[in-house]
Interface confidence: low
Amino acid sequence: SQVSQNCHNGSYEISVLMMDNSAFAEPLENVEDAVNEGLEIVRGRLQNAGLNVTVNASFMYSDGLIHNSGDCRSSTCEGLDLLRKISNAKRMGCVLMGPSCTYSTFQMYLDTELSYPMISAGSFGLSCDYKETLTRLMSPARKLTYFLVNFWKTNDLPFKTYSWSTSYVYKNGTESEDCFWYLNALEASVSYFSHELSFKLVLRQDKEFQDILMDHNRKSNVIVMCGDPEFLYKLKGDRAVAEDIVIILVDLFNDQYFEDNVTAPDYMKNVLVLTQSPGNSLLNSSFSRNLSPTKRDFALAYLNGILLFGHMLKTFLENGENITTPKFAHAFRNLTFEGYDGPVTLDDWGDVDSTMVLLYTSVDTKKYKVLLTYDTHVNQTNPVDMSPTFTWKNSKLPNDITDRGPQ
């Protein structure tokens, strides 16, 4: 049976899937607030452009009867249940916002023919790459692998004079949704990261990780992990660490490093933190009042999803083009739109580009300092601190393999 799209005659709707399983354990009220704030901005922008149209959101709630674990790993069917709800109601907006879980998104793509665009705050996994009508507004795993490979190969910076080709990856299976898929992409034999490295080993047990820190026979000095400093401390504690160990802590969606008066704990001295620069204006936003530093990015992605919808609506209406066409469904990519916190760029496959930031702990000030930034759009590393006050010898990052002997 055909589902009619509420997407014509001056009335345009975005369907927002409100799933119990989401990439971040964020109360649905906060997501609703973000969507509503976005709608207000969109209405204003359309009005300013002389487009007298109605824009609304319809929230589709999962009843939680079948899938109520609140865990993305069990979310495969929930997205399909919600799609069936849409099908039964025979009503759909111009755009579908959600789901955020990789399994849900992947399954929805397998089991449905999506003739409308889908915007996701999440869907981090490689299995959601290259989907023609999917737009992802939080950095997917593919972008992380590009950064890591780029950084591993870099050998022409004052603080990094060795190319790296090896790594350990710590992955114990208890990670958050974003970390789970980021680490999966590093672990997978099919991934860019795996294929550019000559050695990579996944450490799955706490003891394996702890042993490597002082193992003279270790195959790499570099360990990639994902989580926040507290997660690292629970694992590493105050254990001694060999002087040429480098831990890369992936913590993309955490603004805490940039907050005033933050001091880096001692156990972070051997650690480089990969994160993203925060959006200052979001901190004062009405809907962010209840958001922790790690949740702002998720809420912002929902808000930006609404703004993207508004941007595409404006573009198509100004050009006199039909909204319910395959052209519209495939248009949410290769563009820049005005997001809540400044311009947002989407790549050729509809994935958000961002500036990743690599931080180190200054041994002088015990503060987090920016070592370099990385622009995912142009795959380029830009050094920021040419004379970092590192813990490592000669204030340079060590070789990834100790005592290689004559090269």
Epitope: S127, V190, H195
Partner: antibody, heavy 122, light 110 residues
Framework: EVQLVESGGGLVQPGGSLRLSCAAS????????MHWVRQAPGKGLEWIGE????????NVHEKFKNRFTISVDKAKNSAYLQMNSLRAEDTAVYYC???????????????WGQGTLVTVSS | DIQLTQSPSSLSASVGDRVTITCRAS??????????LQWYQQKPGKAPKLLIY???KLASGVPSRFSGSGSGTDFTLTISSLQPEDFATYYC????????FGQGTKLEIK
């Protein structure tokens, strides 16, 4: 039509060396990883190693690392397997094959050469 | 390396029979909801030919009588109705971590 054609096989004495070639045609050579797989008479398939033609990155199975080297010549659209210190147990048909990665992230050998026989015997 | 063990090692069957070959991995070959396991057919003097990829997806040009199933560590190749041209050796292969093959299952005419 995508084609892989191996050459360079033959009879070689134990301790000797041999260089096998794999000429690729019908596709963009630098876009696909190239692999070498061998099969001893009456036995199963054994992966030797792989090379990324675009940048020459190689991964060779531990078992062969000290004796076998994989290389490419992009100008000739060819991959090579240099085999040194050959032993009787290296007697096998050697195949080159490429991997394709689908957009869903699946990775497998989709095209194979016809194979070339290497016999190590005195 | 991930070890793959096929059973049986050899099998006699007749045209029209339904045949099942199994492949067991020493550890899971699953990755984001799919299994990185392939099945190949090889005839004497010929190179292997891809039949099934990702455990259950039929390769281009392969007859629908071939099907694959399984996940994690246990996989099955089924030929629903044997044809004369199906008598060959079948190999499973994983691409989850590097590349390894099963030892092969030789399918012979009864």
């Amino acid at each position: 039509e995508v084609q892989l054609v191996e050459s360079g096989g033959g009879l070689v004495q134990p301790g000797g060396s041999l260089r096998l070639s794999c000429a690729a045609s019908g596709y963009t050579f630098t876009s696909y990883w190239m692999h070498w797989v061998r099969q001893a008479p009456g036995k199963g398939l054994e992966w030797i190693g792989e090379i990324k033609p675009s940048n020459g990155l190689t991964n060779v199975h531990e078992k062969f690392k000290n004796r076998f080297t994989i290389s490419v010549d992009k100008a000739k659209n060819s991959a090579y397997l240099q085999m040194n210190s050959l032993r009787a147990e290296d007697t096998a048909v050697y195949y080159c094959t490429r991997t394709i990665t689908t957009t869903e992230g699946y990775w497998f050998f989709d095209v194979w050469g016809q194979g070339t026989l290497v016999t190590v015997s005195s | 390396d991930i070890q793959l063990t096929q059973s049986p090692s050899s099998l006699s069957a007749s045209v029209g029979d339904r045949v099942t070959i199994t492949c067991r991995a020493s550890e899971s070959v699953d990755y984001y909801g799919s299994s990185l396991l392939q099945w190949y057919q090889q005839k004497p003097g010929k190179a292997p030919k891809l039949l099934i990829y990702a455990a259950s997806k039929l390769a281009s040009g392969v007859p629908s009588r071939f099907s694959g199933s399984g996940s994690g560590t246990d996989f099955t190749l089924t030929i629903s109705s044997l044809q004369p041209e199906d008598f060959a050796t079948y190999y499973c292969q994983q691409t989850r971590k590097a590349y390894t093959f099963g030892q092969g299952t030789k399918l012979e005419i009864k």
